[in-house]
Amino acid sequence: MMTGTIETTGNISAEKGGSIILQCHLSSTTAQVTQVNWEQQDQLLAICNADLGWHISPSFKDRVAPGPGLGLTLQSLTVNDTGEYFCIYHTYPDGTYTGRIFLEVLESSVAEHGARFQIP
């Protein structure tokens, strides 16, 4: 039975040109995390595998950095980065857990006065 839950940073906003950390945390399970996939809509951004380490999509090689931890850092944000991001935790023996984050990339002046939660 799958007992775990994924906690995410939820809905976040960031400034155009800035950086943001996408973070998920799997709790309430003793299952072993074998791999975490980070996806944007249907596009694979990065993989962190327990054996093979981090591998980043060539399409994002200059704008995505691994970590911290199992999280992902997006850099040089553009308005086109606005959208849904998914952390997909592959675990044994539980199976797959998926977390969702919605990122809104705003023009600088808007982001400065936004009331949304933002990771520093």
């Epitope: 791999q35 999509s57 797959t96």
Partner: antibody, heavy 120, light 107 residues
Amino acid sequence: EVQLVQSGAEVKKPGASVKVSCKASGYTFTDYYMHWVRQAPGQGLEWMGLVYPYNDNTGYNRKFKGRVTMTRDTSTSTVYMELSSLRSEDTAVYYCARGGPSNWNYFDYWGQGTLVTVSS
Amino acid sequence: DIVMTQSPSSLSASVGDRVTITCKASQNVVTAVAWYQQKPGKSPKLLIYSASNRYTGVPDRFSGSGSGTDFTLTISSLQPEDFATYFCQQYTLYPLTFGGGTKVEIK
């Protein structure tokens, strides 16, 4: 036209090492992952690992960890796969294969294969 | 590791036949499945990726379907050049793994 040209057949004794090369042309070498897949005579396909020429990042199938090393030379657009402590079960055709553009973990172009025979 | 169980391991068919090859994953791989064709003494060639996307230049008689754990490669009307061995591959989880292959022979 994308081409992956591999080095010639090798005959090795048990315990020895072999280094197979794969020269890429027809695309930007550092924009795509390269994988190595082997096929024993009359058998299926077995994934060995990958190397990212952009930053020399590697990841190996745990079955081969400690015995396999994948490297790249950006000046010649060539990747290498070295397998050590050879045994008879390593007799196979070894292929380099380029990771796809939308996801680097399927293979859109393959080398012609290099037969490695391990025999005393 | 994810096990890809391919069936049948071989089949005999005639030109013009509709051929279906199946691949079952030991766990959910969503749609991260590719299909390859390999002829004797040659390298594999990509046919299908993302379970159902036909690769550039692949004839439309080849189609792929499925998601989760069950996947199918269909050749709608078998041609003489289609006699070969076909492999499925999952690319959701490392290590990447292949099915055992299906050899399509002339009846």
